[in-house]
Interface confidence: low
């Protein structure tokens, strides 16, 4: 399977909400012994390998934001911890999974990574990630709503195998 990032750049005004999205592509094994661990974290540019750093999103680390379920099942994060930080990660039946960030501030600007780990018999078998950038703007030049920029076809399937 692969992870696609429909948009590589999100430009949003301060105070707005944004939903960053990744999509699971390709054949997904629905066997009883196969589950998927999906999560989000921040990273930094200028690395040899994109998404190699695992930084918290608003003090929530990648395991705080994770979803753990079978194939294309729907799921979302526990509401208490994440929602206190204005965050919610979710997954639908179609392979889409996302993180919603509420009331954006300039500090939210940066590189965000989605991570999917396929787990068989409790062992990590395959891992892929996708990356996208969020720019939060303020002042007269800021857009009134979030503007999204589609990924190039090359970028939209950002694959990193274990």
């Amino acid at each position: 399977f692969k992870v696609a990032t429909p948009y590589s750049l999100y430009v949003c005004p301060e105070g707005q909400n944004v939903t960053l999205t990744c999509r699971l592509l390709g054949p997904v094994d629905k066997g009883h012994d196969v589950t998927f661990y999906k999560t989000w974290y921040r990273s930094s540019r200028g690395e040899v390998q994109t998404c190699s750093e695992r930084r918290p999103i608003r003090n929530l680390t990648f395991q705080d934001l994770h979803l753990h379920h079978g194939g294309h099942q729907a799921a979302n994060t526990s509401h208490d911890l994440a929602q206190r930080h204005g965050l919610e990660s979710a997954s639908d039946h179609h392979g889409n999974f996302s993180i919603t960030m509420r009331n954006l501030t300039l500090l939210d600007s940066g590189l965000y990574c989605c991570l999917v780990v396929e787990i068989r018999h409790h062992h990590s078998e395959h891992r892929v990630h996708g990356a996208m950038e969020l720019q939060v703007q303020t002042g007269k030049d800021a857009p009134s709503n979030c503007v999204v920029y589609p990924s190039s076809s090359q970028d939209s399937e950002n694959i990193t195998a274990a």
Epitope: Y37, F62, R127
Partner: antibody, heavy 123, light 107 residues
Framework: QVTLKECGPGILQPSQTLSLTCSFS??????????VSWIRQPSGKGLEWLAH???????RYNPSLKSRLTISKDSSSNQVFLKITSVDTADTATYYC???????????????WGQGTTLTVSS | DIVMTQSPSSLSASLGDTVTITCHAS??????LSWYQQKPGNIPKLLIY???NLHAGVPSRFSGSGSGTGFTLTISSLQPEDIATYYC?????????FGGGTKLEIK
């Protein structure tokens, strides 16, 4: 109670491969956020981070040694391994394994260390 | 790589003194900085994490401060058991790097 213990050959000749084992208890490397690093310290000198392995088998290496390092794990037996190929006298050091937890609000530090295993590379 | 520079490399102080050790990062490491104490013949022991948080069981005379590129470890009312080498370590980015160490001795 969290404990880690390193095991190594003690003495190697130049060009041989070093195989180290870190056996741990008190935590599971299958748990989200857990990770184990290898760190070394030549006698009387400072600490040098070598490699890290995450719970999900993601791995990180020190670029200065990356071509010679391989880190791996066996979560079911609570062990982490490190191989260093083509050792030289400069690899003479005490090798530590240490737990690094990426946890809520206070991640990215080594909270538990093994006692260390000493390697001497000599012809 | 982020280079961590500690100063001084060694210092001598009297019992009861307040001792300050500094650590400078070549790049911004936010607050992802830890301090470790290594007594002669022993393993490193975590003292401070996230720049200023005292690890469980560490005496309150140890404190840490700073963010970005400049950090300080302070030991107030120096005790005989504080004789050790102290290391800072950044966790901002790989490769993880340590300072060269500060060897603390009693006058």
């Amino acid at each position: 109670q969290v404990t880690l213990k390193e095991c190594g050959p003690g003495i190697l000749q130049p060009s041989q491969t070093l195989s180290l084992t870190c056996s741990f208890s008190g935590f599971s490397l299958s748990t989200s956020g857990m990770g184990v690093s290898w760190i070394r310290q030549p006698s009387g000198k400072g600490l040098e981070w070598l490699a890290h392995i995450y719970w999900d088998d993601d791995k990180r290496y020190n670029p200065s040694l990356k071509s010679r390092l391989t880190i791996s794990k066996d979560s079911s037996s609570n062990q982490v391994f490190l191989k260093i190929t083509s050792v030289d006298t400069a690899d003479t050091a005490t090798y530590y394994c240490a737990r690094r937890l990426d946890g809520y609000n206070d991640p990215y530090y080594f909270d538990y260390w093994g006692q260390g295993t000493t390697l001497t590379v000599s012809s | 790589d982020i280079v961590m520079t500690q100063s001084p490399s060694s210092l001598s102080a009297s019992l009861g003194d307040t001792v300050t050790i500094t650590c400078h990062a070549s790049q911004n490491v936010n607050v992802w900085l830890s301090w470790y104490q290594q007594k002669p013949g022993n393993i490193p022991k975590l003292l401070i994490y996230k720049a200023s948080n005292l690890h469980a069981g560490v005496p309150s005379r140890f404190s840490g401060s700073g963010s970005g590129t400049g950090f300080t470890l302070t030991i107030s009312s120096l005790q005989p058991e504080d004789i050790a080498t102290y290391y800072c370590q950044q966790g901002q980015s790989y490769p993880l790097t340590f300072g060269g160490g500060t060897k603390l001795e009693i006058k």
